[in-house]
Amino acid sequence: LGCDLPQNHGLLSRNTLVLLHQMRRISPFLCLKDRRDFRFPQEMVKGSQLQKAHVMSVLHEMLQQIFSLFHTERSSAAWNMTLLDQLHTGLHQQLQHLETCLLQVVGEGESAGAISSPALTLRRYFQGIRVYLKEKKYSDCAWEVVRMEIMKSLFLSTNMQERLRSKDRDLGSS
């Protein structure tokens, strides 16, 4: 991928998913009525024509927003601090790496539009999540619904990254 989103980035993404899974505090079976349609922009991660700049931008904005969401007083009150610290550290490492990659991609002349457009869409999506948490008064079930939603969207974003890596491998071997 140019800067190659190396294997360890995929590994860090999977570690983030594992941490999010371990953070569960209450049984999700208690929270069915709190489900909400956050309208994750699936089209952003489902396309077959994946551009390097687009993928990196989506991943960067996703991780940035997750970091912000779980880096608040409300979040500290809701989750196990040890796991939360591990989550912050892992996200910070991934963000640093992605920032280096993004600078390189922009330097290679890929469109700035491919970078700014996903960011705006994802900010709206995460704003919806923040509004929901506030509406629900940051209840345990609201945080549980959000944790599951973040896991789903991060899983889809990580899949997009894997698809791009395998596409690059195919191009490299042909």
Partner: antibody, heavy 121, light 107 residues
């Protein structure tokens, strides 16, 4: 293609034990819960319980609590429903179905083909 | 537990008829209601989820409405393949519960 494939029909005697299975494929098995539903001959659908295969957390209908055990083995994408001591009244068709958990998606959108359990002396 | 009551328990109709089945919950379930169709010897099939969303691949003659405690499944023009039993189901809370079913028969 998403599929839930259940184990075959069983004929058992009262007092015997039984474990039936439901194997998921074509999707991320740990991203969905698996529910079990009973249908006695000529009757309606009864929800028995549900499992989150990612950590094997379960919830049961009060009518089935203590009567059956739901489990899962995520390494082989399979959920199970078991009885330690069958009764004649357990004779029924048993279905598994996937549920999106807390994600906003259709409930029980894919079902297994059903396992017919007959308990008779 | 939330009780789900369907009416009627059975009905006779002709091809082309408009058919309406109702489902009432014993307490408010917001919009967490699903409708299933089951034919003899087959597994149930999801038709409508979240009260009014049509499941992928289901013909548009099926529609759902309602929220709170009262819900409706409508088949705008009954087709030969629609003769089956229909169930409502709430997923507002555990234990999940089904209605007793409505059998749609040929008149």
């Amino acid at each position: 293609e998403v599929q839930l494939v259940q184990s075959g029909a069983e004929v058992k005697k009262p007092g015997e034990s039984l474990k039936i299975s439901c194997k998921g494929s074509g999707y991320s098995f740990t991203s969905y819960w698996i529910g079990w539903v009973r249908q006695m001959p000529g009757k309606g659908l009864e929800w028995m319980g549900i499992i989150d295969p990612s950590d094997s957390d379960t919830a049961y209908s009060p009518s089935f609590q203590g009567q059956v055990t739901i489990s899962a083995d995520k390494s082989i994408s399979t959920a199970y429903l078991q009885w330690s001591s069958l009764k004649a009244s357990d004779t029924a068709m048993y279905y598994c179905a996937r549920h999106p958990g807390l994600n906003w998606a259709p409930d029980f959108d894919y079902w297994g083909q059903g396992t017919l359990v007959t308990v008779s002396s | 537990d939330i009780q789900m009551t369907q009416s009627p328990s059975s009905l006779s109709a002709s091809v082309g008829d408009r058919v309406t089945i109702t489902c009432r919950a014993s307490q408010s379930i917001a919009g967490f209601l699903n409708w299933y169709q089951q034919k003899p010897g087959k597994a149930p099939k999801l038709l409508i989820y979240y009260a009014s969303s049509l499941q992928s691949g289901v013909p548009s003659r099926f529609s759902g409405s309602g929220s709170g405690t009262d819900f409706t499944l409508t088949i705008s023009s009954l087709q030969p393949e629609d003769f089956a039993t229909y169930y409502c189901q709430q997923s507002y809370s555990i234990p999940i519960t089904f209605g007793q079913g409505t059998k749609v028969e040929i008149k």
